[in-house]
Structure formats: C-alpha cells, structure tokens
C-alpha cells in the first residue's frame, strides 16, 4: 500500500491481494486498504467502502478517523486497541455504518478521544459499558467531550425487550465516566421520556440536543444541576406545556438558550404560566414562532399573543353527563 503524502492531500490505498497475514505490525505511515490518508492533516477516511471491521493497520498518527457508510455490524471490545495505542485519535466518526451492537470497552485504549459520532446506526444493543469500558461503580473518567447519538434507534422489530431510552441512559451513566461530557446529541430517537436521573449526572453539559423525539412532558426532568448549559434543543417533540418548576429551572440557568419550535402546544388554562413566562424571558430562541396546536379553536395562534382570557379549560362534566 502507498505511503502517505507529505502534503495535506489524501493518498489512497487500493485494495490488494497480498497475503492477509502480517508478519510484522504495519509501518507507522502505512494507509489501510480502502482508506485515504493524510499525515499532514492527521486524518484517515475509510468512507462508503462496505468495511465489515475496523482496519487493523491504522497509522499511529491518526487524529481524525472517518469510518462512515460501512457495514461494521458489531463493534467489539477493544475495536481500536492497537500497539502502539492510537494515542492521538481525538475525533471518531462511525455514522451510518450499520452498527447494531456496541460492546463493553469498544473505545478502550483511546486516551485522547474527545468526539464520537455513532449517529444513524440502528443500535439494538448498546452495552452499558460501551463508553466506560468497565463495570466498576466508578470508572476511570472518559476523555469524551462530545457524543453524537442522533437517530440510533433501531426499527421496532429489532429492539430488545427493554426500554430503548433506558438502554441509552445506562450507557451514558455507567461508572460516572462521562462527567466531562459537554455536548450530547440524542435527536431523532423516538424518546418518549427522559429518565429523571440522566441530566443530574452529566454536570458539564453545555449543549443538549433532544430534538425530533416524542417527549410529551418534562415534568420529572431536572435541569437544576446543568449550570453550564448553553443550548437545549427540544424542537419537534410532543410537548404540550412546560410547567412552573421547569420554567423556573430554565430561567435559573445563566447561559441557556432553549429551542422549542414545532411542538403541539395545548393552549388551555394550564398554559397560562408558560405564556406569562415566554413574554418575560429571553432564554427561548424564536419564541415568536411558537403556536398552539390544540384545542382546535386555538390552532395556529401565536403563544406570545395570548392573554389569560384566551386560556380556558372546559369544565369537567360529571360522569353521568359525559358521552363516550
């Protein structure tokens, strides 16, 4: 295979039919077959090549590794463990590689891994110890700062007999390894709820993306500990109203920007506090775009233009007067 070029342009390694047995480890500047490498940019791209496993002969200089659009299926323990270790690898993108299983310790021996993208993989089996690497109650801290897990929900028929939300949260919380995580993206995962303990145990979060899920309520979610939170994306969920406790917590976060577009807000008497808050707060971005979805008579009304007289609740009829 070709050595890498000294310029920042990429050199590629064509597939070869030599013996698959490597009598000695690869030279440090080799480029794996089916990949493109730039030593100057410290980058290796093995993209859309239908790879079924992580190349064994990754160059030691790699800082940015793209393994997108492949057919990896399973990421085993130590999938990136090498001798010498890939000590410089900081950004790893595995999106769209048909991963359905990530095993415990898959990312061990990557001491500099700051950014990991597993998006667009149908993760039916994400080990609780995928990111912590250990089943200890308190693991060594992960170096991860940014974890991108958008659209990792598998098709309904491929899910395990357990809560998908619970599986993901277990991996996020195991061993308290992700205490340093600053960006977490969980968009497009059909989340119905957010387990109440997840945010409390990720105190360093700056950016949290929960957009395009199916969240109905934030009643049991506490944002109080997230004092560093700068952006909270809740667009395209199923939120009906934000209650006082949530409003107060969000208002108390010093740097926060909240995104609430495209939720089916229910503009009845329970919405009064939220409307009052919206009129006063600066934390909601694009608040003038928020509109009612229900009841029918309120559809498309702008929340900021409502007053208390608009927000009424139909009286609850006695059971004898209710119709089916």
């Amino acid at each position: 295979s070709s050595p890498t070029s000294s310029a920042s342009s990429f050199s590629s390694s064509a597939p070869f039919l030599a013996s698959a047995v490597s009598a000695q480890p690869p030279l440090p500047d080799q480029c794996p077959a089916l990949c493109e490498c730039s030593e100057a940019a410290r980058t290796v791209k093995c993209v859309n090549r239908n790879l079924t496993e992580v190349p064994t002969d990754l160059p030691a200089y790699v800082r940015n590794l793209f393994l997108t659009g492949n057919q990896l299926a399973v990421l085993p323990a130590g999938a990136f463990a090498r001798r010498p270790p890939l000590a410089e690898l900081a950004a790893l993108n595995l999106s769209g590689s048909r991963l359905d299983e990530v095993r415990a310790g898959a990312f061990e021996h990557l001491p500099s891994l700051r950014q990991l993208d597993l998006s667009h993989n149908p993760l039916a089996d994400l080990s609780p110890f995928a990111f912590s690497g250990s089943n200890a109650s308190v693991s060594a801290p992960s170096p991860l700062v940014e974890l991108i897990l958008n659209h990792i929900v598998p098709p309904e028929d491929e899910r395990q007999n357990r809560s998908f939300e619970g599986m993901v949260v277990a991996a996020l919380l195991a061993g308290r390894a992700l205490q340093g995580l600053r960006r977490l993206e969980l968009a497009s995962n059909h989340f119905l709820y957010l387990p109440r303990d997840v945010l409390a145990q990720l105190p360093s979060l700056r950016h949290l993306d929960l957009s395009n899920n199916s969240l109905v309520s934030l009643t049991y979610v506490s944002f109080r500990n997230l004092t560093h939170l700068e952006s909270l994306h809740l667009e395209d969920n199923a939120l009906k109203v934000l209650h006082n406790g949530t409003l107060a917590e969000l208002q108390g976060l010093p740097h926060i920007r909240v995104f609430l577009d495209n939720n089916p807000w229910v503009c009845d008497c329970h919405m009064a506090d939220m409307v009052t808050w919206l009129k006063e707060t600066e934390v909601v971005q694009g608040k003038d775009r928020l509109t009612c979805a229900y009841p029918e008579k309120m559809r498309n009304r702008v929340l900021l233009e409502l007053n208390s007289a608009d927000l009424d609740c139909d009286p609850i009829l006695p059971p004898s007067l209710q119709t089916s």
Epitope: V21, S22, A77, P84, S112, A140
Partner: antibody, heavy 121, light 111 residues
Framework: EVQLLESGGGLVQPGGSLRLSCAAS????????MTWVRQAPGKGLEWVSE????????NYTPSLKDRFTISRDNAKNTLYLQMNSLRAEDTAVYYC??????????????WGQGTTVTVSS | DIVLTQSPASLAVSLGQRATISCRPS??????????IHWYQQKPGQPPKLLIK???NLESGVPARFSGSGSGTDFTLTISPVEAEDTATYYC?????????FGGGTKLEIK
Amino acid sequence: EVQLLESGGGLVQPGGSLRLSCAASGFDFSRYWMTWVRQAPGKGLEWVSEINPDSRTINYTPSLKDRFTISRDNAKNTLYLQMNSLRAEDTAVYYCARPDHDYNPYYFNYWGQGTTVTVSS
Amino acid sequence: DIVLTQSPASLAVSLGQRATISCRPSQSVSTSSNSYIHWYQQKPGQPPKLLIKYASNLESGVPARFSGSGSGTDFTLTISPVEAEDTATYYCQQSWEIPLTFGGGTKLEIK
C-alpha cells in the same frame, strides 16, 4: 475453567524441526488471540509469536520470524508452533498464553505449564 | 525494540519488610490514561502469574501487599510486607509495541 496444555516438545538435533501444540479448553478459543512465550534454562521470558482469532494477523519476534510459524485450528481448539532449522539457543520451555480479553493482547493471565524443547547433538 | 531494564537482579529482604523492584523501559510506554507495563511472578517449575496490569492495577485474586506505580520510563513493583511465599522471580513486560518484551527478571529471596 481455562486450561492450556502444551505438547510436542522433546530432544531434537540442530537443524531439525518440531511442531508444538497447545490444546485449549474451558473458553471460546475462536475469540481470542493466542501467544507463545519461551524461557531458556535459567534465563528470562521471551515473547515468541502471536496470532489473532481468524489467523489474519500474525506477529513474531524479529529474530525468529524466518524459522518459526504460528498457526491455529479453531475447530480443534488448538494452537501450533512449527519450528524449523532449530539451534541450540532455541532450547527452552515453551508456554502458550492467553489474554483475558478478546482483542490485541497486552498482558497474559492464562498460561499453560509449558513443554520443554532441547536442541542438542 | 523496547528494552526493559530491571533492577536489582536479585534482592534479599527480611520477612515483613518492604521489597522494591524497578523497571525502566528504553522509551516511554505511557499515554495520558494508561501505562503499558505489567508485572508477573514466577516460582521455580511454574509458569508466570500476572500480578499487576497497566502499571498499577492489581489482578483479581492477588494479595493487596503487591502494588505497582510509575509512568513513562520509570516503574516500580512494591511488596509490603513481604511474606515467605513471595520467594520468586519477578518480571516486568511492556505491551506498548511489537515485539512485546520482558525485563531480565529480579530474584527475590526472603531472609
């Protein structure tokens, strides 16, 4: 219980050949890298060779790679070391060893009892 | 190849006292999170037994009187307090790169 049992050692003349075997039991042999380590009489440990689960990656200590060949048969749960052109300095106890995880070995916590190879005329 | 220099070659320590063994790799074998040095104990006629992995992590079932420390190019195995059954030869091993290499060994005798 993990068990590794070496065999095939013995007395051989210089220039001769031997094939060592290591029969594995008590674990899924096909998942693990396997390694040979040797120890000359009264001397220290020397890493010889390793092989990954599907035999696609093989490494040797540089001074031995031209004469020694590691292989495995996952169907038989057996690891092999073919030794050719043997020399007096190859006289040693040969151990097979296994790491505790199923990726590149960093250390070894399962060892066989060893088989003795003596190269002498 | 990475050369591991172990010292002393032999050591006699009184029962209950502390034994300290040094291992110095010819180049750094540490990242920010791991040191790729491991320690073994070998008694006559037996295979080696793993004591410590990654410089300081005690292997399951190994008594707590064994401990490891160090990083970069300077590592230490400490046994305290020494017991009679600790009479053995101790080896360090690096797994930073291929070929894996062992130190020359330190023979510990209990007085």
